[in-house]
């Protein structure tokens, strides 16, 4: 019977070949005839087994009785030809104790160049090199590659110039780049890049000037290219020791402070801030294309100023040949770390005496002579590291009798033009 | 653009006071940044002497805290280096130099002045 | 106060190739905010000193890509990776971490 002796092959056709460009449909086919129970057609590559292969058995009996012959036809479909499906193809059958391999067919590729790589949209500074990547195959080789900046050649022709990278020295406007890839059978064009230009990221972000509120800050522009910067954005944020903002950090950890500076100057006050407080600030600029890069966080602090108002609910009372003055905080900002209160007296004929109390907030006075003084007055003024903050309207010395509060006097808050004055001391 | 340019004499006696000017064009003294002067020794060492803040406070190195006074005139958007007692070994080519805030940074110098101290 | 201390006090380089000065600071220039206050000034013959570097390795305005600096708190490099004609002068590095400013002694650099 057909098939049992080892020098019978049982196929009657073999593989064909097909060669074909990218994407092409195609079906390998193989016939046998076998007497008994149809065996299972397999299809190797390459000498492998293909286990998931989208292949289709027909069986087409001979005779009417099961132990006669049938012919047996698979069919290999071979969908999206790629390069991956190249190569040797056979069917395969065991009969009995016996593997049988059917002579050999070929799948070969063939046609115009196929993108590995192709070039990708992005974003770059002015005038700063950069790559785009490019690479194709073929069969057939060679495939030669041709780059093309806004549709121009950026050789005389392919394989001439750069390959499979381009090297870019820098651009100062967007453009496009393609690149055409060659081969015996034409030419390829990739999908076309957009390289939008984008301005540097400023330089030389520094500090100008420092008011206990405002922060004056400048910087250098880079370069944009041929598109003008339209405004450079600055943003500040407060910053805690424990937050973390170090000299490359990307992102600020709580809401900033944005503020637009429109250009030039590239200078900008930044207002409304706290005294004596340590900011982080950064600076990108903007042109028609976009955004630069931030710069770095800058550490910046606004320095301490002096107290804004005068100490609140000063009383001063007599009692013979001393004087209890005391006083509360000002309600006012201090604008920085509380040092001390300096405090005045005056007499109407006598010189002011100038006193610094510290950080209490309450002296006792010793008076000269028989406590006959007449007209007496008290000022008092916070200071910080920043000087000396308004003076108190002056207060008279009110005579203490027992068995009576002391009188309060309550304070205008910070006077637009002070009632007493004292000389500079 | 930001200039400073220098003036005073090149050659000054022994025992007698220094004294150069700095004027600066294209931003104000008292709008920011300290404004400094440097000495450069004739084997190239580079010595910095003091500045004058825009918000009139000063600095100045300790090797030079008595003899030296840095002031300015707001009007004339000048400022002035005054070094007094000099002997020979202030002989030196002197710069003015603008400071950013933060850690004193310098980016705009002048063009130096030579002064030579002899009898 | 910070001493400074650079070498090679000369080096001599052939054009196209790079170049390296060293500069020590007797202390960290490293500040809790996370920069190193070191900067780098060229001073070109005859010529003012001119703003390179700052905060260790921030390029200045203007200043070519081929110069950068590296470094830790107290070992710092200046790297020119190209030398160009227009680059010999003498480098000073100096430290701005806190007054008194001071510079290092100067590395002049020449074209073999």
């Known amino acids: 019977p057909r098939g049992t002796q080892a020098e019978e092959s049982p196929f009657v056709g073999n593989p064909g070949n097909i060669t074909g460009a990218r994407g092409l449909t195609g079906t390998l086919r193989c016939q046998l005839q076998v007497q008994g129970e149809p065996p299972e057609v397999h299809w190797l590559r390459d000498g492998q087994i293909l286990e998931l292969a989208d292949s289709t058995q027909t069986q087409v009996p001979l005779g009417e009785d099961e132990q006669d012959d049938w012919i047996v036809v698979s069919q290999l479909r071979i969908t999206s030809l790629q390069l991956s499906d190249t190569g040797q193809y056979q069917c395969l059958v065991f009969l009995g104790h016996q593997t049988f391999v059917s002579q050999p067919g070929y799948v070969g590729l063939e046609g115009l160049p196929y993108f590995l790589e192709e070039p990708e949209d992005r974003t770059v500074a002015a005038n700063t090199p950069f790559n785009l990547s490019c690479q194709a195959q073929g069969p057939p080789e060679p495939v030669d590659l041709l780059w093309l900046q806004d549709a121009v050649p950026l050789a005389t022709a392919p394989g001439h110039g750069p390959q499979r990278s381009l090297h870019v020295p820098g651009l100062n406007k967007t453009s496009s780049f393609s690149c055409e890839a060659h081969n015996a059978k034409g030419v390829t064009t990739s999908r076309t890049a957009t390289i939008t230009v984008l301005p540097q990221q400023p330089r030389n972000l520094h500090l100008v000037s420092r008011q206990p509120t405002e922060l004056e800050v400048a910087w250098t522009p880079g370069l944009s290219g041929i598109y003008p910067l339209t405004h450079c954005t600055l943003q500040a944020v407060l910053s805690d020791d424990g937050m973390g903002i170090q000299a490359g950090e990307p992102d600020p950890p709580e809401e900033p402070l944005t503020s637009q500076a429109s250009v030039p100057p590239h200078q900008l006050r930044l207002g409304s801030l706290h005294p004596h407080t340590p900011y982080h600030i950064r600076v990108a600029c903007t042109s028609s294309q976009g955004p630069s890069s931030w710069t770095h966080w800058l550490p910046v602090e606004t320095p301490e100023g002096v107290p804004l108002g005068p100490p609140e609910n000063i009383s001063a009372t007599r009692n013979g040949s001393q004087a209890f003055v005391h006083w509360q905080e000002p309600r006012a900002p201090l604008q920085g770390t509380l040092l001390g209160y300096r405090l005045a007296y005056q007499g109407q004929d006598t010189p002011e005496v100038l006193m610094d109390i510290g950080l209490r907030q309450e002296v006792t006075l010793e008076l000269q002579g028989d406590g006959s003084v007449s007209n007496l007055t008290v000022c008092v003024a916070a200071y910080t590291a920043a000087g000396d903050g308004p003076w108190s309207l002056p207060v008279p010395l009110e005579a203490w009798r027992p068995g009576q509060a002391q009188p309060v006097h309550q304070l205008v808050k910070e006077p637009s033009t002070p009632a007493f004055s004292w000389p500079w001391w | 653009q930001v200039q400073l340019v220098q003036s005073g004499p090149g050659l000054v006696k022994p025992s007698q006071s220094l004294s150069l000017t700095c004027a600066v064009t294209?931003?104000?003294?008292?709008?920011?940044?300290?404004w400094n002067w440097i000495r450069q020794f004739p084997g190239q060492k580079l010595e910095w002497m003091g500045y004058?803040?825009?918000?009139?406070?000063?600095n100045y190195n300790p090797s030079l805290k008595n003899r030296i006074s840095i002031t300015r005139d707001t009007s004339k958007n000048q400022f002035f280096l005054k070094l007094n007692s000099v002997t020979s070994e202030d002989t030196a080519t002197y710069y003015c130099a603008r400071g950013w805030l933060l850690h004193y940074t310098m980016d705009y110098w002048g063009q130096g002045t030579t002064v030579t101290v002899s009898s | 106060e910070i001493v400074m201390t650079q070498s090679p006090s000369s080096v001599s380089v052939t054009l196209g190739q790079s170049a390296s000065i060293s500069c020590r600071s007797s202390r960290s220039l490293l500040h809790s905010n996370g920069f190193t206050y070191l900067y780098w000034y060229l001073q070109k013959p005859g010529q003012s000193p001119q703003l390179l570097i700052y905060q260790m390795s921030n390029l200045a305005s203007g200043v070519p890509d081929r110069f950068s600096g590296s470094g830790s708190g107290t070992d710092f490099t200046l790297k020119i990776s190209r030398v160009e004609a227009e680059d010999v002068g003498v480098y000073y590095c100096g430290q701005n971490l806190e007054l008194p400013l001071t510079f290092g002694g100067g590395t002049k650099l020449e074209i073999k």
């Open positions: 294209g931003f104000s003294i008292s709008s920011g940044y300290y």
């Open positions: 004058r803040s825009y918000d009139g406070s000063n």
